[in-house]
């Protein structure tokens, strides 16, 4: 059929909860292409009707929710003007047993469900939630050994659980839970994460580099909306936290009431020797109190600030 078979991706999935997989393969999917999903070499494409339990949503295949019978090989066909590529995705559905204490870890989980915390350091766990824009995700709750996590050493920030001064007792089975809303219906997502510990530095003692900001000022009009990116390069297996702070407080906490200034979701691009991370800060409306205040971007031991200033008056 003239289609290039690219690779086979294996995914272990939990029954009875939503799952989505995005058919992206840069640079193929960055141009003008059409994406169509099929199941088990069927000639009939997956439905695009949003009421269907399994349907295609733009480049995604979405299961609301996943069921036992959904195990199998799915193909996404990427057609360009002069090209055709096919990605094979092998989905295996299993019954989740997060609260079964006889299960010492879940060995067949994919890597993002196995995470490592570094003893004595401030570190974090990530709740990996890959869903299309049509899915609205609620706040994340974190559990350890089936008990909701509380205590001042733990802070929930976006999709991460920040753990300060990691101890040996922090190892074990975790789960992050979120309510997903799609077309008015609600579904529970519960991701189990097996967390191990290490004393190893992990990133060879190198320090993350903040490319921007550079302890600089930005001229911005009062009342405007402003988005500033913090760009950071760091080693591939770093465990550094990246965040924005003001007055030594996470901006999301500092502006918890008004939510006028928020930290964005972290993204990253992978290069051969390092990762480039971007985490933005959004000022929905710049106020007088924001001027002259250092907004700090932190990455591990590195930090850099931006300071807002009023534009110089134009006397022309």
């Amino acid at each position: 059929d003239g289609c290039n078979d690219i690779f086979m991706k294996n995914e272990m999935l939990s029954a009875s909860q939503p799952f989505a997989f995005n058919c992206t393969f840069p640079p193929i999917t960055s141009g003008e292409v059409s994406v169509t999903w099929y199941k088990n070499s069927s000639k009939i494409p997956v439905s695009k009707i949003i009421q269907s339990r399994i349907h295609q949503d733009e480049t995604w295949i979405l299961f609301l929710p996943m069921e036992w019978g959904d195990s199998g090989v799915y193909q996404c066909v990427i057609k360009g003007r002069d090209s055709c590529h096919r990605i094979h995705v092998n989905l295996t559905v299993f019954e989740k047993q997060w609260c079964d204490t006889s299960v010492k870890g879940l060995p067949n989980l994919s890597d993002e469900y196995k995470q490592i915390l570094h003893l004595g350091k401030d570190d974090s766990l990530t709740c990996h939630l890959h869903f299309p824009k049509s899915c609205i995700l609620g706040p994340i709750k974190w559990y350890k050994d089936c008990n909701e996590i509380t205590g001042e050493r733990f802070t929930v920030l976006e999709t991460r659980l920040l753990v300060s001064n990691v101890s040996a007792e922090d190892r074990g089975n975790y789960a992050c839970q979120v309510i997903l809303t799609h077309s008015g219906k609600q579904y529970e997502v519960l991701n189990g994460i097996t967390v191990s510990i290490t004393e190893r530095a992990g990133y060879g003692g190198s320090v993350p580099k903040i490319i921007y900001p550079k302890n600089n000022s930005i001229e911005v009009q009062l009342g405007t909306t402003l988005i500033v990116d913090c760009n950071i390069t760091d080693t591939k297996d770093n465990t550094n936290l990246r965040c924005w702070r003001v007055n030594n407080t996470l901006v999301d906490d500092y502006y918890n009431e008004s939510k006028r200034i928020r930290e964005g979701v972290e993204t990253h691009a992978s290069f051969r020797e390092y990762n480039l991370y971007t985490v933005n800060i959004t000022f929905l409306e710049v106020k007088m109190e924001d001027y002259g205040l250092p907004f700090m971007c932190h990455a591990g031991v590195s930090a850099a600030y931006i300071m807002l200033q009023l534009p110089a008056p134009d006397f022309r």
Epitope: D111, A168, I197, T198, E199, D237
Partner: antibody
Framework: EVQLQQSGPSLVKPSQTLSLTCSVT??????GYWNWIRNFPGNKLEYM?????????YYNPSLKSRISITRDTSKNQYYLQLISVTTEDTATYYC??????????????WGQGTSVTVSS | EILLTQSPAIMSATLGEKVTMSCRAS?????MYWYQLKSGASPKLWIY???NLASGVPARFSGSGSGTSYSLTISSVEAEDAATYFC?????????FGGGTKLEIK
């Protein structure tokens, strides 16, 4: 159950390169830390280095100019290369990994060991 | 580099005797790991995170210590305990092993 199977020559000539393979079953080398350790005659253990889940490598500074640890995720194997060997490198070489009771540094799983003699 | 000094280098014990071997670190160590090595076999994880026994290790073994001083104790030695025991640290690189304590049974 995690198993580590070692392969490679037992005799290497001085100034040549020692190359060993560790084949892993029951776990993915894209999780955790994958170590090499050697035991010299007379029972002296030396930690040589590791390759991590992301491909990051750590080498013992005493070996840094001569050692290379690499991996092939498609084969679920990792490798040790030691260049310019001398008779001082005669030892039993082990690959090992942790993760026991969620502790990456507890080296619970070991290969069977490869006894390497450096001799002309 | 953290130097781990094990003492004694060789010790001899009679069946049923209580024995303690020591591992001293040249700088503070967060946790100590112990391995058992018998001739012709691969090392076995024996004690991890200073005081936790690995699977299959008899309850007569125990580990303790903090800072720069750690020890492995056998409450009542049995014949199968004859082996060399190594301590190891992952707190500071380069990661190091002690010189070992060889336990012989009289």
């Amino acid at each position: 159950e995690v198993q580590l199977q070692q392969s490679g020559p037992s005799l290497v000539k001085p100034s040549q390169t020692l190359s060993l393979t560790c084949s892993v079953t029951g776990a993915s080398i894209t999780s955790g830390y994958w170590n090499w350790i050697r035991n010299f005659p007379g029972n002296k253990l030396e930690y040589m280095g590791y390759i991590s889940y992301s491909g990051y490598t750590y080498y013992n500074p005493s070996l840094k100019s001569r050692i290379s640890i690499t991996r092939d995720t498609s084969k679920n194997q990792y490798y040790l290369q030691l260049i310019s060997v001398t008779t001082e490198d005669t030892a039993t070489y082990y690959c090992a990994t942790g993760g026991y009771d969620y502790v990456e540094d507890a080296l619970y799983y070991w290969g069977q060991g490869t006894s390497v003699t450096v001799s002309s | 580099e953290i130097l781990l000094t094990q003492s004694p280098a060789i010790m001899s014990a009679t069946l049923g005797e209580k024995v303690t071997m020591s591992c001293r670190a040249s700088s503070n160590v967060r946790y100590m790991y112990w391995y058992q090595l018998k001739s012709g076999a691969s090392p076995k994880l024996w004690i991890y995170l200073t005081s936790n026994l690995a699977s299959g290790v008899p309850a007569r073994f125990s580990g303790s210590g903090s800072g720069t001083s750690y020890s492995l104790t056998i409450s009542s030695v049995e014949a199968e305990d004859a082996a060399t025991y190594f301590c190891q640290q992952f707190t500071t690189s380069p990661y190091t092993f002690g010189g070992g304590t060889k336990l012989e049974i009289k």
